[in-house]
Interface confidence: low
């Protein structure tokens, strides 16, 4: 009795079990009854990768240089060309028929893996304490400088587009120093003032003299800094912040202190 | 008859430009990649340069890039290579050759007759 | 930058078979050519995608390529064949040649 099915790696034809042809040949001829089914190898640019009954091989994938791509690794009678894609441009299917330009990581992004032939850049914001600012396929966020390292102090606080900037400790102590110089500037002028109305209220007990040009007060010799002989630090020059030179510490001597 | 015929080749003081042409003939000249070749006196073949069929892509051997420019004129049938900033190193046999069909498959399957190019002060 | 490396010179009685070597990184991945060039003329390819024959090349050229190595095989090699010989591949968008192999039929 004729089969109904048959075994792995055969196929039923005219009521007959006949071999599938092995990876890498096609059918030429069924089996028949007292024959086996006959085979033949594919071509050089062709392949099967299974066993089957193909009258016809497949071709060979070509890898277009002109889509980017170029061979991976090349076909053989039971595989096909693998392709993939040229220095910096990736897949855009799995099946990778064409290639497409790496995508950068754009300011305050940075790249968490960099694109191989077949798959793009995987981009990541950048977290506090870290930034980038360019755009970039292959740059990952950096950290933000550590401006105590370097002995200076954060003038200006960074993002993830920009690093933070630095400056000397000076302008720090500038910000301190200023107000206290503007209070004690302030208190002076009231004093001033009340002593010039206790004078002007005085009873003239003396002789009369001839009327006195009222004196011109100038209130910036009573500022300290202004005295050479009072002690003030040398980067405050009439509660101006001076620059610190490059080399000289900012500290007050013992002397300056006293 | 495909036939390639390359002309400009000559003389040139370093520094100085040249520009290659090669007609090309007997065949689709859209239809294929075309690449420049030179071989230096006694040397072997050292590939310069190909175009792709359509013209869209470009590809220059490191030692020349930025330096040389690869460019097709259909119209003309001609391939061209603009060479400036000519080193004494260039000195060449400059040929142009078709490439066979689809780039690495085929290779280069018809070749110019060569023009010489002679860098020198 | 991909290299391919081949002798300088090799040797052959007429009649006998010449193999001219190609070596390179995994180059049984990439497609050789072959290209005969004859002292004074322009090279013509004997072999593409590593062993089919152009029309008009002998069909004793043969070539074959596997692991790091193609080789270009010349049977019953003949005076007529005494040249250099030239391996080429592409590779990442260059086109890479061999420093050549000149082949001396003796006798």
């Known amino acids: 009795e004729p089969p109904t099915a048959c075994r792995e790696k055969q196929y039923l034809i005219n009521s007959q079990c006949c071999s599938l042809c092995q990876p890498g040949q096609k059918l030429v001829s069924d089996c028949t009854e007292f024959t086996e089914t006959e085979c033949l190898p594919c071509s050089e640019s062709e392949f099967l990768d299974t066993w089957n009954r193909e009258t016809r091989c497949h071709q060979h994938k070509y890898c277009d240089p002109n889509l980017g791509l170029r061979v991976q690794q090349k076909g053989t009678s039971e595989t096909d060309t693998i392709c993939t894609c040229e220095e910096g441009l990736h897949c855009m299917s799995e099946s990778c028929e064409s290639c497409v330009p790496h995508r950068s990581c754009l300011p305050g992004f940075g790249v968490k893996q960099i694109a191989t032939g077949v798959s793009d850049t995987i981009c990541e914001p950048c977290p506090v304490g870290f930034f980038s600012n360019v755009s970039s396929a292959f740059e990952k966020c950096r950290p933000w400088t550590s401006c105590e390292t370097k002995d200076l102090v954060v003038q200006q606080a960074g993002t993830n587009k920009t690093d933070v900037v630095c400056g000397p400790q000076d302008r720090q102590r500038a910000l301190v120093v200023i107000p206290i110089c503007l209070g004690i500037l302030f208190v002076i002028l009231l004093l001033v003032l009340v002593f010039i109305k206790k004078v002007a209220k005085k009873p003239n007990d003396k002789a009369p003299h001839p009327k006195q040009e009222p004196q011109e007060i100038n209130f910036l010799d009573d500022l300290p800094g202004s005295n050479p002989a009072a002690p003030v630090q040398e980067t405050l020059h009439g509660c101006q912040p001076v620059t610190q030179e490059d080399g000289k510490e900012s500290r007050i001597s013992v002397q300056e202190r006293q | 008859e495909v036939q390639l015929v390359e002309s400009g080749g000559g003389l040139v003081q370093p520094g100085g430009s040249l520009r290659l042409s090669c007609a090309a003939s007997?065949?689709?000249?859209?239809?294929?990649?075309m690449s420049w070749v030179r071989q230096a006196p006694g040397k072997g073949l050292e590939w310069v340069s190909v175009?792709?069929?359509?013209?869209?892509?470009?590809y220059y051997a490191d030692s020349v890039k930025g330096r040389f420019t690869i460019s097709r004129d259909y119209s003309k049938n001609t391939l061209y290579l603009q060479m400036n900033s000519l080193r004494a190193e260039d000195t060449a046999v400059y040929y142009c050759?078709?490439?066979?069909?689809?780039?690495?498959?085929?290779?280069?399957?018809?070749w110019g007759q060569g023009t010489t190019v002679t860098v020198s002060s | 930058s991909y290299e391919l490396t081949q002798p300088p010179s090799v040797s052959v009685s007429p009649g006998q078979t010449a193999s001219i070597i190609c070596s390179g990184d995994?180059?049984?991945?990439?497609?050789v050519c072959w290209y005969q060039q004859k002292p004074g003329q322009s090279p013509v390819v004997v072999i593409y995608?590593?062993?089919k024959r152009p029309s008009g090349i002998p069909e004793r050229f043969s070539g074959s390529n596997s692991g790091n190595t193609a080789t270009l095989t010349i049977s019953g090699t003949q005076a007529m064949d005494e040249a250099d010989y030239y391996c080429?591949?592409?590779?990442?968008?260059?086109?890479?040649f061999g420093g050549g192999t000149k082949l001396t039929v003796l006798g």
């Open positions: 995608h590593d062993n």
């Open positions: 080429q591949v592409w590779d990442s968008s260059t086109v890479v």
């Open positions: 995994k180059l049984g991945d990439k497609y």
């Open positions: 175009i792709s069929d359509s013209g869209g892509r470009t």
């Open positions: 050759a078709k490439e066979g069909g689809d780039y690495y498959y085929y290779g280069m399957d018809v």
């Open positions: 007997g065949f689709t000249f859209g239809s294929y990649a």
